[in-house]
């Protein structure tokens, strides 16, 4: 387990090996107190498949940089992204895809087909989410890719498209 | 509240009844430090409605056995399952169903209809998730049933189909 | 950070300012021990767009009143609602909408279009969920609006329609 989970915990307090159940600072230092979280809404103007986010959202123990959430404390993170699509159906079906990327590698994706009847309709709403539970190291980047980003309606739904992470456990 | 939440906490330290606010070990032993979690991906070859999972996933304080997650520490758990379907549409609609079972009882299900136009198309993607917040006792089993398991495409989407649990609170 | 996070922690124990790493009660009082949660199923008989919930569900540190969850401890909350719809398709498409309201203001919504082929079918299932991570103050209300509440089939799916919240961190 990590031993730096208490802010301002001095390094000169020794941690006993093995059973430290009566060494209270030892117990405390091993306890999973650390909390890190983020909750960002999608940027107003999207112009590429890698989504950008409003950096004035909730950020605590996580940095935002160039479309990435950057992890500052290692541990087990719960990551969840939810997107709201509004599709003007062409005369063929459309596959909506949401990719969660960790360090520019696809970690998990969600796909849904809309407009499957092949009829041109006024509009079709679709909501897509993806979650992940994963160990992340310091400076790991978390990002989201959507090939059909033009269907993310940021003007009608400015609050609906979010990327969120929170640290569940900073112990191994 | 559980009293064994600190690893290696000796049984011979008495817990005061009532207000133990100045008995630090008492406080610590009652504090919700315990963390248990699992994140398993679906097994490559599915041949029955009860899904099997890759036991080499993330498992901490939870066991995997015969398609079940088996709880080892009692408490309030957040349970979430997400599945990615790929359906070759027949000439009728298809109902996709995901059932979360606790001790072999259906606790929660999610259903979505696809191929509703009744047209035979090449393929339709659908993503389905289900969550649960529930008190689980030691040896409680968590499992997932999918009637239409043949539509879970484990070769194209080996990472997308997951069952995850994590202990939120080990106090009552 | 909040200083009342240990139940029964006496007020007469002073909290040192600055580095309190060796003042164990200080550390404990600042630690995010507080846990609050709720998991409620939808009421059997719905007759308005603001959903009502069965108050005999799981409630801990959160109150239920008149369709609202009422927050009792300030902090960062994870809020999630999931609904199961069963739609008898008319001869036009139907937009299903789920709104999460904080203090009667729409905070987040999810929309999905069903029956998009415009064909009258026997039934179409659709599952819709919405989550939120937000700082909530004492007496904040959390509620859910569904315009098409008549499609929430509480008799077939009494367990599927839920509203859940849990406190992630009571620190700022």
């Amino acid at each position: 387990q990590r031993t730096d989970s208490i802010p301002n915990s001095p390094d000169n307090i020794p941690l006993r090996g093995g059973n430290c159940s009566e060494d209270l600072l030892c117990i405390l230092k091993r306890a999973p107190f650390k909390k890190s979280w983020a909750y960002l809404q999608v940027a107003k103007h999207l112009n590429k498949t890698k989504l950008s986010w409003n950096k004035d959202g909730i950020l605590h123990g996580v940095r935002y940089q160039d479309g990435n959430l950057v992890i500052q404390f290692p541990g087990l993170y719960f990551i969840i992204c939810q997107l709201q699509f509004l599709v003007q159906c062409p005369n063929n079906s459309v596959d909506l895809k949401l990719e969660l990327l960790i360090n520019k590698h696809i970690k998990k994706q969600a796909l849904v087909t809309v407009c499957e009847s092949g009829m041109q309709t006024k509009h079709v709403y679709q909501n897509l989410s993806q979650f992940l539970l994963d160990y992340l190291q310091v400076n790991t980047t978390v990002s989201v890719n959507v090939d059909t980003f033009q269907y993310i309606d940021t003007s009608t739904f400015p609050l609906e498209n979010v990327l969120s992470v929170f640290l569940y456990s900073n112990s191994d | 509240q559980r009293t064994d939440s600190i690893p290696n906490s000796p049984d011979n330290i008495p817990l005061r009844g009532g207000n133990c606010s100045e008995d630090l070990l008492c406080i610590l032993k009652r504090a919700p430090f315990k963390k248990s979690w699992a994140y398993l991906q679906v097994a490559k070859h599915l041949n029955k409605t009860k899904l099997s999972w890759n036991k080499d996933g993330i498992l901490h304080g939870v066991r995997y056995q015969d398609g079940n997650l088996v709880i080892q520490f009692p408490g309030l758990y957040f349970i979430i399952c997400q599945l990615q379907f790929l359906v070759q549409c027949p000439n009728n609609s298809v109902d996709l169903k995901l059932e979360l079972l606790i001790n072999k009882h259906i606790k929660k299900q999610a259903l979505v209809t696809v191929c509703e136009s009744g047209m035979q198309t090449k393929h339709v993607y659908q993503n389905l998730s289900q969550f649960l917040l529930d008190y689980l006792q030691v040896n409680t089993t968590v499992s997932v049933n999918v009637d239409t398991f043949q539509y879970i495409d484990t070769s194209t989407f080996p990472l997308e189909n997951v069952l995850s649990v994590f202990l939120y609170s080990n106090s009552d | 950070q909040r200083t009342d996070s240990i139940p029964n922690s006496p007020d007469n124990i002073p909290l040192r300012g600055g580095n309190c790493s060796e003042d164990l009660l200080c550390i404990l009082k600042r630690a995010p021990f507080k846990k609050s949660w709720a998991y409620l199923q939808v009421a059997k008989h719905l007759n308005k767009t603001k959903l009502s919930w069965n108050k005999d569900g799981i409630l801990h540190g959160v109150r239920y009143q008149d369709g609202n969850l009422v927050i009792q401890f300030p902090g960062l909350y994870f809020i999630i609602c999931q609904l199961q719809f069963l739609v008898q398709c008319p001869n036009n498409s139907v937009d299903l909408k789920l709104e999460l309201l904080i203090n009667k203001h729409i905070k987040k919504q999810a929309l999905v279009t069903v029956c998009e082929s415009g064909m009258q079918t026997k039934h179409v299932y659709q599952n819709l969920s919405q989550f939120l991570l937000d700082y909530l103050q004492v007496n904040t209300t959390v509620s859910v609006n569904v315009d098409t509440f008549q499609y929430i089939d509480t008799s077939t799916f009494p367990l599927e329609n839920v509203l859940s919240v849990f406190l992630y961190s009571n620190s700022d």
Epitope: K48, T49, K50, K97, E99, L101, I102, N103, K104, H105, I106, K107, N145, V146, D147 | L86, Q88, K122, H123, D153, S155, T156, P158, L159 | -
Partner: antibody, heavy 124, light 110 residues
């Protein structure tokens, strides 16, 4: 070790359908992703599409309206059909196995095994 | 999808190092760590030399290395040898779950 062999007619008339088959030996077609790539004389490579073990497909957007890929697990083969061909479709056509790992995340690692290629000429 | 941009030709003397660039977009090279490089001798099928930006398949000399910066990938060959003379093509996975290749670069060993 996996080996690939393309086969099919070397000459196709304009407006007709080009049909090629790739036979896989040394491995199961159900275990990997399979791609078709072409290369006009003196030009660069162009990716046509891929077929997964499940039978689902991804196609190059510029060719999507004309391409169909399928597989036959009993024969350990996958095939390419390109409709309404023109002289611009004249090229060497390669089938290839995609190197994909999925231990922790998706490792899309390119094409690690190629057939020797077959020349297709579109001419009347 | 547009082809990735590579120089038509590069050259170098034996023992030297050369670098071939491959420019894409934020939807391919700049998005993923899924860039590959191929060597193609005349009349032969391509051979995978680098995958996932900088990894080498077994059997490929460590004289071959890859990197990316922004939307541009690079292949560097150090200690140039006569039998390195060939066409080199880059490839990248794209946001639409497809692959895109570069136009190819002819390497001449002087």
């Amino acid at each position: 070790q996996v080996q690939l062999q393309e086969s099919g007619p070397g000459l196709v008339k304009p407006s007709e359908t080009l049909s090629l088959t790739c036979t896989v030996s040394g491995g199961s077609i159900s275990s990997y992703y399979w791609s078709w790539i072409r290369q006009p004389a003196g030009k660069g490579l162009e990716w046509i599409g891929r077929i997964f073990a499940s039978g689902s497909t991804n196609y190059n957007p510029s060719l999507r309206s004309r391409v169909t890929m399928s597989r036959d697990t009993s024969k350990n083969q996958f095939s390419l059909k390109l409709s309404s061909v023109t002289a611009a479709d004249t090229a060497v056509y390669y089938c290839a196995k995609e190197r994909v790992g999925v231990q922790d995340y998706y490792h899309y690692s390119g094409m690690d095994v190629w057939g020797q290629g077959t020349t297709v000429t579109v001419s009347s | 999808q547009s082809a990735l941009t590579q120089p038509a030709s590069v050259s170098g003397s034996p023992g030297q190092s050369i670098t071939i660039s491959c420019t894409g977009t934020s939807s391919d090279v700049g998005l993923y760590n899924y860039v590959s490089w191929y060597q193609q001798q005349p009349g032969k099928a391509p051979k995978l030399m680098i995958y996932e930006v900088s990894k080498r398949p077994s059997g490929v000399s460590n004289r071959f290395s890859g990197s990316t910066s922004g939307n541009t990938a690079s292949l560097t060959i150090s200690g140039l040898q006569a039998d390195d003379e060939a066409d080199y093509s880059c490839s990248s996975y794209t946001s639409s779950s497809t692959w895109v290749f570069g136009g190819g670069t002819k390497l001449t060993v002087l």
